[in-house]
Every structure is written in C-alpha cells, then in structure tokens.
C-alpha cells in the first residue's frame, strides 16, 4: 500500500480493508487477521464478531465486512442481528424460566418459539366453534348458530374415504 499524500488528511485515501497506521507514518496497512474496515479512512480496523457457544457462523468475516451469526440447531435467533439465541420448544409449548412447558388449556402455540396464545373466542364474532382447539392449534370458527339449518351439526362430518388408487386433486 502506498503512503497517501492528501494535503488535508493523509488517511482519507486508505480504502476499506485497510487502516491508517500511525506506527508506520500513516501508511495504509491491511487490516490484521480477523478484523475489518467497511469504510475508507479508518484509523483502526474493527475486530470481527466471533460466533461461539450457541452461535454459529452464517457469514465469514472479510477484510471489509463483519461476520454474521445465526444459532445452532435447537435454538433460534432473537433481536436484530441475531444478538441472542433462544432455545426452541415443541409446538404446543412455550419457553419459561424453567424450560419448555406445555400450553395451558385454552391456549396454543403452533411454532417452536414464542408464547402460548389464547384460542380465538368465536362467540365474540357471533360464530360457533367448528373445530376444537388443541395445544398446537387454534380453534376453527364456523358460521353463527343462527346460520345453521335446524338439525344441522356445528361440527363437520368426516369426509368420505377415497377410493384406492386416486391421488388427491
């Protein structure tokens, strides 16, 4: 790297991936290993983020850009830039301070992360429960009881069995 000769700031011509080295009379020196500078004119290179523990490297550090991390299997990212890794739970569970716990009756979680949420209250929309909720799934609301003809059930009857050899459409 040639020494820059700018009259204003001798460091201004140092490109990304280098730093202006005061120990070497302000010559542009390449960033040391495991460090980077993403813009020109830098007086230091930033040390690369190290993806360790529950973090794993999603993108390697280069001389001009920082490393990016995600989470090891069984964990998922939280926050911008994957600042934290949180343990996965099964569907039908939520993560508490004591670990993964099943959703309480009347609540569900259809993901491996997040909290258990209450089943939808169909009656608030004037509807009836078409399919009951579980720990993993919300209820399915159907038409309002008034919309049903007399004698009709609010739960759909089972679909007829398909004939062998027919694939679903």
């Amino acid at each position: 790297f040639e020494r820059t000769r700018s009259l204003q700031d001798p460091c201004s011509n140092c490109p990304a991936g280098t730093f202006c080295d005061n120990n070497r009379n302000q010559i542009c020196s390449p960033c040391p290993p495991n460090s980077f500078s993403s813009a020109g004119g830098q007086r230091t290179c930033d040390i690369c983020r190290q993806c360790k523990g529950v973090f794993r490297t999603r993108k390697e550090c280069s001389s001009t850009s920082n490393a990016e991390c995600d989470c090891t299997p069984g964990f998922h990212c939280l926050g911008a830039g994957c600042s934290m890794c949180e343990q996965d739970c099964k569907q039908g569970q939520e993560l508490t301070k004591k670990g993964c716990k099943d959703c309480c009756f009347g609540t569900f979680n259809d993901q491996k992360r997040g909290i258990c949420r209450p089943w939808t209250n169909c009656s608030l929309d004037g509807k009836s429960v078409l399919v009951n909720g579980t720990k993993e799934r919300d209820v399915v609301c159907g038409p309002s009881p008034a919309d049903l003809s007399p004698g009709a059930s609010s739960v759909t009857p089972p679909a007829p069995a398909r004939e062998p050899g027919h694939s679903p459409q």
């Epitope: 290993p33 190290q50 360790k52 830039g81 600042s83 934290m84």
Partner: antibody
C-alpha cells in the same frame, strides 16, 4: 473514530441506586454489543454486563439481581443502573464497545469514579 | 466462571530488554473454530485499558509489533521484544470464551 463518554453522579449514598449513562459519538450504536466494566480503586477489572442495540442483555451472574442495562438508540446512549449499593461498589466505571458479546473490548470510555458514601 | 491467573504480578524491566508475562486459564480457551479466545490489555497509569492482542495472537490495529501473543488451550504468554518507557502500566489477560468474561489479576510492568 468511535468515542465513548460516561456521565453520572460521582457520589451515591449506601442503599441507593447508582445510575450512569454512556454516550457514543463518531459512530452508530447499532450492530455492536456495549458493555459496562468496573475497577475498584487499586484493584482489577470486573465485567458487569452488556446490551445489544436491539435491547438484548447479558448480566454477570454475580450482579444479576442488582444490575439493569438499557439502550436509547435515538440518543446513541446506553445506561447502567446498580441498585442497593454499598461501599464495595466504589469503583471507576467504564463503558466499552464489545465486539462479540463478551470479548475484545476495542473502544473504552475514559471512566468515571463513583464513590459510595453517606 | 473461568478463573484467570497471571504471573508475575510485578515485573521490573530495563528499557531495551525483553519482557514476558504468563497467563493461565482454569479451562481451555481453544474453541472449535480453532481460535483461542484470549485478549491482552494494557492499562497505562491514569488511563483506560487498551486492547493489545485478541484471539490469543492477533495484534490489534495500531499496536506496535514489539508486542506479541502466543499460547493455546490454558497457557498463554505476552512478550515485549524490547521494552520502552511508554510500555509501563498494568497488563491484563482476559478470557472471551464464556460469559462472564473474566480478567487476570494484572501484572505491573515498571522500568528499573
């Protein structure tokens, strides 16, 4: 270049809460971890905890019940609160930019001495 | 937590002579990515600590090349090839493998 500046009262009474703010200039608070580290007079360094700009925190277990760290990205600041202080909390308090979430403190504030005394 | 132990705690050195500081960790700092997660810091009198070495052996940008770090696993060394008057202060090793990061007790380097 990145500069950090601690601010807050230099004297706190026992049992009260110590509050400090670190202002980051010359760069954005985004995309890094930001730590608090303290040093009692004539002694060594103790890491207290970090915050990511998104608000995620990690606190030293030895201080967990007493420490709160928060961030204000609009002001490029992060803050430390230490409750129920005693004379043992008298120290120089440093804020620092943490490159990896618990490692390689590349940029430090100049430190501020907080004395706990009645 | 990981305990860091430094020796010696005091190191009188003649200018121009080499100096060496040892740091030992209570468990290995070698991670599966092949890096030793150990930093070295220098705190000059009345100043904040400054990073010298990261990942065991990488000199931070702007740090003079008379400083070098070596070692792996649990045993690490900071060497100064020729001590200068401006190198006086307290040197700390720090493990950056696990939270909480922990520091050694410090080694005070002084000029004879």
């Amino acid at each position: 270049q990145v500069q950090l500046q601690e601010s807050g009262p230099g004297l706190v009474k026992p049992s009260e809460t110590l509050s400090l703010t670190c202002t980051v200039s010359g760069g954005s608070i985004s995309s890094y971890y930001w730590s608090w580290i303290r040093q009692p007079p004539g002694k060594g360094l103790e890491w207290m905890g970090y915050i990511y700009y998104s608000g995620s925190t990690n606190i030293n277990p030895s201080l967990k019940s007493r420490v709160t760290i928060s961030v204000d990205t609009s002001k490029n600041q992060f803050s430390l609160k230490l409750s129920s202080v005693t004379a043992a909390d008298t120290a120089v308090y440093y804020c620092a930019r943490d490159q990896s979430g618990g490692g390689s403190f590349q940029h430090w504030g100049q430190g501020t001495l907080v004395t706990v005394s009645s | 937590e990981i305990v860091m132990t430094q020796s010696p705690l005091s190191l009188p050195v003649t200018p121009g002579e080499p100096a060496s500081i040892s740091c030992r960790s209570s468990q290995s700092l070698l991670y599966s990515n092949g890096y030793n997660h150990l930093d070295w810091y220098l705190q000059k009198p009345g100043q904040s600590p400054q990073l010298l070495i990261y990942l065991g052996s990488n000199r931070a940008s702007g740090v003079p090349d008379r400083f070098s770090g070596s070692g792996s696993g649990t045993d690490f060394t900071l060497k100064i090839s020729r001590v200068e008057a401006e190198d006086v202060g307290v040197y700390y090793c720090m493990q950056a493998l696990q939270t909480p990061p922990t520091f050694g007790q410090g080694t005070k380097l002084e000029i004879k």
